[in-house]
């Protein structure tokens, strides 16, 4: 190989050992029989050399640095050449570095030809191995603007006082052009301006200078986004930190077309604007930091550009002004991530503050719109708390657990509407009375409705799930001892049509000791399946539940258990079941940890089934499934 550098090129070539590998045999640069491991060639010099091994690319790297002085004379503006040409260099991983020094008052602009650049974060790498590292200068301090790959949106980077651009090419890469040019501009009066051009839909992730380290103190950095007028842009902050400011405030400023309040100033913790039409600028402004404990300012954000959807021009009013202790969250439903570009799906408050999820709270009227290609990608979760603090005031009071019509009119599917029902401990209990009798969801008879009620304890320490219940069954009411959550969960878009079937009333009733009581009024000719709470995990220790089963005068109820034995093994206490005729008070007691479960039994009158658990050994839980079937008395049952 021969490298001869023109005298006035201001180029230095450095060949040095790269990252050490576990290769057994060392490799050397050979010059006139001398073996060396580092070679520096400066302007005007000529060196002829070879390598002592077959694959020098596994051992050595080459750096080509060109110093461009714009201080003492005119700057060589225009397209930047790869000099020396890559064809003249040994096939090593190579880094071309251009170090441009200019006066503080001179603006320098790097212009990138297509493909434009895509910024990458720490730990990321470029698929083709070609990286562009760009840094600027503040007095003597080097500031990293960022590391970039090809195939992105960044078209221009403007800086002041100097710029250092490093282009890293893997040894096998055929690239023989720099892909950028340098132009002079008037002073930009800030650290840098990054221009990002969107031709169509797409996204760009960008970072503050020095990311993930701190943004330079009291500096200003601007991103200019060029967006076709027919598309919409939304900004979301992926990661940020604030420093400790002594004077001024760290903020972002937007220049948004058509806005009457330019610049729009936001705190970094605010929701950022969305649904913006056309070009806009975003600036990050630092502050004077506390000398003792400066902290760091850093920002990583994403700009998503996509077509406006039909929904984006519709405003929906969600009136929660008459609600109390309620929050509504619209968020993306979980999906498998695809590798191709997926347009963003945003919900916007007042048409401008858009984000992938939005929580609305009670006490206000909210105006929302959507910026989303497919609203089925979103769903709604609502939480409402109904609490009673004074038992004298609440007793016998009733509340309707119904989804407000405002929410049902939104174009987004309701996933969960949860009511947290709170009562004063040991003073009151709760009763749930459905508008339509409920069916308990079991494997034997699953619910096939568009929604269900999930009833569970709302006491943090208690793991008690009563079950999933849907309209169209035999459960007339559910009484529970203490705090519960009732969640209306929808399973199909047809819920909108079936919404009239929802309706549950909760009343506060005198306190009782049992964990739950189910009142069951079976219908003729239908088999009612019932199962103990916490199915699959076992009824909690020392918990007692009852079923009050009504048998009409002209009917006989057949009670059938679906196992021979309960399977429970008690560590302490006893597990038992009581079946009691309500008219005669006659009862049968079964030891669930010892006895065989009863064979099918016939009941001519209403009866109770009470199941009480012991403290079971782990893995030997109490799960019981039973059914009740009514048949007319005239049938001979012998």
């Amino acid at each position: 190989f021969e490298i001869a550098l023109p005298r006035e090129s201001n180029i230095t070539v450095l060949i040095k050992l790269g990252t050490p590998t576990l290769l057994a045999k060392p490799c050397y640069i050979v010059i006139s029989k001398r073996h060396i491991t580092m070679l520096s060639i400066k302007s005007g010099e000529r060196i002829v050399f070879t390598f002592s091994c077959q694959s020098p690319e596994n051992h050595f790297v080459i750096e080509i640095q060109k110093n461009i002085d714009c201080m003492s004379g005119p700057c060589p503006f225009g397209e930047v050449q790869l000099q020396p040409s890559t064809s003249l260099l040994p096939t090593l991983n190579r880094t071309f570095i251009w170090d441009v020094k200019a006066h503080k008052s001179i603006g320098l602009e790097l212009q990138f030809s297509i493909p434009r650049l895509r910024q990458i974060g720490p730990g990321e790498s470029c698929p083709d191995g070609v990286t562009h590292s760009i840094s600027g200068r503040i007095d003597a301090t080097v500031v990293r603007i960022g590391t970039f790959c090809s195939n992105g949106t960044v078209s221009r980077i403007k800086m002041q006082e100097g710029v250092k651009m490093a282009l890293h090419l893997p040894w096998f890469h055929p690239r023989n052009v720099s892909g950028f040019s340098i132009a002079n501009r008037s002073s930009i009066k800030r650290l840098c301006i990054i221009e990002s051009v969107f031709e169509g839909e797409g996204s760009a992730t960008l970072m503050s200078a020095n990311y993930p380290e701190g943004f330079p103190e009291d500096e200003l950095m601007t991103w200019q986004f060029v967006v076709p007028a027919h598309l919409r842009a939304s900004v979301s902050f992926l990661n940020f930190n604030l420093s400790n400011c002594e004077r001024k405030e760290e903020r972002v400023e937007y220049y948004i077309p058509g806005s009457t309040t330019n610049p729009e100033v936001f705190k970094l913790e605010d929701k950022q604007p969305g649904n913006m039409a056309g070009n806009f600028n975003l600036s990050l402004q630092g502050c004077d930091q506390d000398a003792q404990s400066p902290g760091i300012l850093r920002l990583q954000f994403q700009v998503l550009v996509q077509h406006p959807q039909n929904e984006s021009n519709k405003i929906y009013v969600v009136d929660l002004s008459n609600e109390r202790a309620m929050s509504l969250t619209i968020e993306p439903r979980p999906v498998k991530q695809s590798r191709k570009f997926v347009p963003g799906c945003f919900v916007c408050l007042e048409s401008r503050t858009c984000s992938s999820n939005l929580t609305l709270t009670s006490g206000s009227k909210h105006k929302i719109s959507f910026l989303c290609d497919d609203l089925t990608r979103l769903w709604m979760n609502v939480e409402k708390t109904i609490s009673c603090t004074d038992h004298r005031y609440c007793q016998r009071k009733s509340y309707s657990l119904q989804v407000p019509s405002d929410i049902l009119h939104l174009p987004v599917e309701l996933h969960d509407f949860s009511w947290k029902l709170l009562v004063p401990k040991d003073r009151l209990s709760l009763v749930l009375v459905p508008a339509q009798k409920l069916q308990q969801h079991t494997h034997e008879k699953p619910c096939n409705t568009s929604f269900s009620y999930l009833v569970a304890s709302a006491i943090p320490s208690q793991d008690l799930y009563f079950g999933s219940f849907c309209p169209g069954g035999s459960i007339k009411q559910i009484q529970v001892k203490q705090n519960i959550s009732v969640t209306l969960r929808t399973f199909a878009p047809s819920f909108q049509q079936e919404a009239s079937r929802q309706g549950l009333t909760v009343s506060f009733i005198p306190y009782f000791k049992e964990e739950g009581v189910f009142t069951v009024t079976p219908d003729t000719k239908s088999k009612v399946y019932l199962r103990t709470p916490n199915w699959d995990r076992g009824l909690p220790s020392l918990t007692s539940v009852s079923w009050n089963i009504s048998v009409p005068r002209d009917q006989v109820a057949c009670l059938t258990f679906f196992k021979e034995r309960s399977g429970v093994v008690c560590q302490t206490g006893r597990a038992f079941m009581i079946i009691q005729e309500q008219r005669t008070r006659a009862e049968e007691i079964f030891s669930l940890d010892e006895d065989v479960l009863p064979k099918p039994s016939f009941h001519h009158h209403s009866f109770w089934v009470n199941i009480s658990n012991c403290s079971p050994t782990s893995g030997k839980q109490l799960d019981l499934l039973f059914s009740v079937t009514l048949t007319p008395r005239t049938v001979d049952l012998t």
Epitope: A4, R7, S32, G44, E45, I47
Partner: antibody, heavy 120, light 112 residues
């Protein structure tokens, strides 16, 4: 045997032009950098210009920049020096020299020289 | 540009006696390769210059071993262990590190 033979020297008036040639033989001309070195009467040696193997890179001493042009024709195994705007101080014997194929700018072979006299 | 300074200007010698010529450069000629990019040339009367020493201390082919080069950085020496009559002429040092290539003023070696 390596041979370099210069020609084209002579008497020329100040401001005039002259084209020197160097015919190379006995080696692969296209594989070597080539230079012109001059020596004013009774004075020392002064490097003038050089040209890369393929003619893509050229360098000159400051005193001749913009007036002299070095070139080569590898097909003809020839090196040239086009001298314009000649001055009295350009009077010298002009040697054609081969740069050795080693590191640095070492001349391993020289021609016998051709005299250029600039005088009115 | 690198300036080369040679001394003495003239060196009268007795055949069979040693001779020494000094050359100094305005900046170091020691390269990162470990070589000193300095050459010595001899121009015999009425002839073209010929290469004697390259890279500071390496003799060119066909050069008698009575010629040797030494030195590093900015100070270099050419020694002739026993001068012979055919060694007369002007000796030039040249920095071969970077363009523009520059020569010393020359040292004229003549027989006493």
């Amino acid at each position: 045997e390596v041979q370099l033979v210069e020609s084209g020297g002579g008497l020329v008036q100040p401001g005039g032009s002259l084209r020197l040639s160097c015919a190379a033989s006995g080696f692969t001309f296209s594989s070597y950098w080539m230079s012109w070195v001059r020596q004013a009467p009774g004075k020392g040696l002064e490097w003038v210009a050089n040209v890369k193997q393929d003619g893509s890179e050229k360098d000159y001493v400051d005193s001749v920049k913009g007036r002299f042009t070095i070139s080569r024709d590898n097909a003809k195994n020839s090196l040239y020096l086009q001298m314009n705007s000649l001055r009295a101080e350009d009077t010298a014997v002009y040697y054609c020299a081969r740069e050795w194929n080693s590191s640095g700018w070492t001349f391993d072979y020289w021609g016998q020289g051709t005299l250029v006299t600039v005088s009115s | 540009d690198i300036v080369m300074t040679q001394s003495p200007l003239s060196l009268p010698v007795t055949p069979g006696e040693p001779a020494s010529i000094s050359c100094r450069s305005s900046q170091s000629l020691l390269h990162s390769t470990g070589y000193n990019f300095l050459d010595w040339y001899l121009q015999k009367p009425g002839q073209s210059p010929q290469l004697l020493i390259f890279l500071g201390s390496n003799r060119a082919s066909g050069v008698p071993d009575r010629f040797s080069g030494s030195g590093s950085g900015t100070d270099f020496t050419l020694k002739i262990s026993r001068v012979e009559a055919e060694d007369v002429g002007i000796y030039y040092c040249m920095q071969a590190l970077q363009t523009p290539l520059t020569f010393g003023g020359g040292t004229k070696v003549e027989i006493k």
